[in-house]
Each structure stands twice: as structure tokens, then as C-alpha cells.
Amino acid sequence: SGTTNTVAAYNLTWKSTNFKTILEWEPKPVNQVYTVQISTKSGDWKSKCFYTTDTECDLTDEIVKDVKQTYLARVFSYPAGNVESTGSAGEPLYENSPEFTPYLETNLGQPTIQSFEQVGTKVNVTVEDERTLVRRNNTFLSLRDVFGKDLIYTLYYWKSSSSGKKTAKTNTNEFLIDVDKGENYCFSVQAVIPSRTVNRKSTDSPVECMGQEKGEFREI
């Protein structure tokens, strides 16, 4: 039961990439507004996005306090212009979100190849260590800081002149691979969290090829 002409939110969905986390829901409001609350399983409810006509709420600031906690959110519906009004049960209409554990569920953003350097028949490929909004001691942590060895990168590489790919893995942000002398290679990387059962992989990085801006060639 709820206030006349007020409908409960539905399709509450977490959208999260590299811990940037937004709760989305439906419907677009008609003569109503929403307020979101978020809590850990054992914590108190905290209100966010007060009396908004949006159908999304950025909850990043809350979840980055402890990305390994499990969070629950709820969306309250109020009549526009009468937000003190409550349902017949004495409280506004609301709907709960699914539970969300950022560390296990945030999507891995598309990685970027920062640089590559050839020294003779070896190439060192470095993946950019993207900054997240997770903080420790007032500094923003990188993806590697947060996930540690739980995060691995897969490198795909191939000769510019052929389509046959090879692959290598690292649990740092650097690869050292063997290449044929005098050949140009192209590279792409993918982030993976092996311990997960879903959302394990990122999309592939943009392809970077030798003989273009990013790299450096040194004949030793």
C-alpha cells in the first residue's frame, strides 16, 4: 500500500565499473520524487539523492568506504510537492535493490596499454594502472592497489603482417615477451579476475601497434 498516485520503483539495478557505482531504477517519475538509502548488512541506513526526479543515484562515495562489504539499497517514492506524505502503513512506498558486493561484482573497465618498448628481440608492454575512487589514507587507490594479485592481465599479440595471435599473462601490469627481429607487432590486453565466477573479464583494450606513437624501439 502507498500514497495515492505514487508507484514503487522497480528494476533496481547496480551499474558499476572500476567501483564507480550507480543505482538505476524505473519508472520515470510522474508527479512523484525519489530518495535512495544505502546500508551495509549490519549498518545504518544513509539517505542519498534526496527527493530527486532522476532514476539513478551515484552511490560511489558510500561503497568505496569498504569495497568488500555487501550493500543493500532501497528507493523510496514520494508524491511530488508532498514529501511528508506517507502510505497507509505509515511509511513511504519503497523497493529494495539486489545485494551488491563491489569487490566481487564491479565490472572491470576497458584497460589501456600505456607503453611498449622493444629491446632487441624482447618487448616490454605496460598496462596503465587505472586510478579508482577507492581511498586509503586520503589517496586514491589504483585498480592494482585494490585487487592485488587477484587481478591479472592477458596480453594478445600478433605480427602486423599476419592474423595468428599469441597470448601471455601477468599478475603485475607488465609483460616481457619474445618477438621476431624486424617484425612489427600489435597488442591488446584484457583484465581478468580469475577468482570470480561472473564479471570475470573486461572488454579488450584498444589495439596498439609498433611503428606508431606509443612505443619506443631500441636496437641493442
Epitope: 592477458t154 570470480r196 570475470r200 579488450d204
Partner: antibody
Framework: QIQLVQSGGEVKKPGASVRVSCKAS????????VYWVRQSPGKGLEWIGY????????IYDQNLKGKATLTVDKSTSTAYMELSSLRSEDTAVYFC??????????WGQGTTVTVSS | DIQMTQSPASLSASVGDRVTITCLAS??????LAWYLQKPGKSPQLLIY???NLADGVPSRFSGSGSGTDFSFTISSLQPEDFATYYC?????????FGQGTKLEIK
């Protein structure tokens, strides 16, 4: 529970092709690569290649020179391996396996391919 | 390509014995190594991943050690069901090569 179920054994003539299927269930198919490994009679394990169902990327053992072609059908969570220009030395048991990045944790039961004139 | 040299090729032992198998990589693979058991007519079964980690449901008598190029696999007290062939595999770079296998037989 997690299962990889492979198609039945095949007997083929030299020069022919064969397609082996591997139907996955019990997990999110696109989250894990599917590896293919073969074992010739009385011999060890030989890695053939893998396919990433998430992005379609295939990696092959380049020493096998185009022997295998790997594909997936995401709608049925099925991986396929086609072997072409079969020769007697391709007689083997072919396994598919789920890759957890650090190892192969679940394996199909194996498909015996016999090449004989 | 990375070569994996496994030794010994075969090994005779008795129930209760401690046995060790080694695997040598031709170049450094950090800890990107797995160990498998295979019984005749069956599929391989994962025992150890990331060189030292026991796979789910695998008895604690199995263990792995090593990093870089030198790895070993130990069964602390052989049980009757452990007589099988064991393989190492590097999962560092393609092609993801296997060792030649070690056949563990009853003495």
C-alpha cells in the same frame, strides 16, 4: 553442477574433416575460455588452442599449422572444434576444458577421433 | 615456445610412500603452473593451480611448490587411488605446453 559434455566418437578417412562439440552447463559460458587438448594413443597431453567466448578471440598452437578451427555458439553454450585434412597422426582423444586462467578446472569426457582408410 | 621437462618419466612406489615429481620450464613462468592427474581412459583432473594452490576437493596429501623455472609436486603418503599419470602444464604463454607426464606405478 558444472559439466562439459562432448560429442561422440568419429571414424574418418584421411583428408576428411570432423567437427567435435563441447556443450557447457552450470556456469556463465562467456566468462571462461574453452581450451582444446588432444592425447594420441599411449602419449601425453598436447595443447591445441583456446577460444574466448566473450570476445571471440582464438589462440592456436601455431605448430599445428591450421589443423583446428575453434568456434562457439553462445546461444547454446557450445564450443566447437573442426579438424581439417585429417591424417592418421590426428587419431587421438580430443578433450575440451574450462580455463580458469590459472589452470583447466573442468574437462569434457573426451571424444575419440580415428583416422583410417 | 616454453618447453616443460618433467621427471621422472615413470616411478614405482608403495602405499604410504612420499613421492616427488619435478617440472622444469625452459624460461621463467613465475607461478603460472598447474598439475593434473589422469587415470587410464579418463579425463585429466586438476590438482594444483598457480604452482602451490590446492584445487577444490583435492586431498591435502597433494602439494606443489616452486616458482620461476623449477617446480615440484609431492604426495606425502601415497594412497591406492593415487597410482596414475601426472602432468604439469605452464599457463604463462601460448602454446600452453604440458610436461611429458610421470607414470606412477605400484612397486
Amino acid at each position: 553442477q558444472i559439466q562439459l559434455v562432448q560429442s561422440g566418437g568419429e571414424v574418418k578417412k584421411p583428408g576428411a574433416s570432423v567437427r567435435v562439440s563441447c556443450k557447457a552447463s552450470g556456469y556463465s559460458f562467456t566468462d571462461y575460455n574453452v581450451y582444446w587438448v588432444r592425447q594420441s594413443p599411449g602419449k601425453g597431453l598436447e595443447w591445441i588452442g583456446y577460444i574466448d567466448p566473450y570476445n571471440g578471440i582464438t589462440i592456436y598452437d601455431q605448430n599445428l599449422k591450421g589443423k583446428a578451427t575453434l568456434t562457439v555458439d553462445k546461444s547454446t553454450s557450445t564450443a566447437y572444434m573442426e579438424l581439417s585434412s585429417l591424417r592418421s597422426e590426428d587419431t587421438a582423444v580430443y578433450f575440451c576444458a574450462r580455463d580458469v586462467t590459472t589452470a583447466l578446472d573442468f574437462w569434457g569426457q573426451g571424444t575419440t577421433v580415428t583416422v583410417s582408410s | 615456445d616454453i618447453q616443460m621437462t618433467q621427471s621422472p618419466a615413470s616411478l614405482s612406489a608403495s602405499v604410504g610412500d612420499r613421492v616427488t615429481i619435478t617440472c622444469l620450464a625452459s624460461q621463467t613462468i613465475d607461478t603460472w603452473l598447474a598439475w593434473y592427474l589422469q587415470k587410464p581412459g579418463k579425463s585429466p583432473q586438476l590438482l594444483i593451480y598457480a604452482a602451490t594452490n590446492l584445487a577444490d576437493g583435492v586431498p591435502s596429501r597433494f602439494s606443489g611448490s616452486g616458482s620461476g623455472t623449477d617446480f615440484s609436486f609431492t604426495i606425502s603418503s601415497l594412497q591406492p587411488e593415487d597410482f596414475a599419470t601426472y602432468y604439469c602444464q605452464q599457463v604463462y604463454s601460448s602454446p600452453f605446453t604440458f610436461g611429458q607426464g610421470t607414470k606412477l606405478e605400484i612397486k
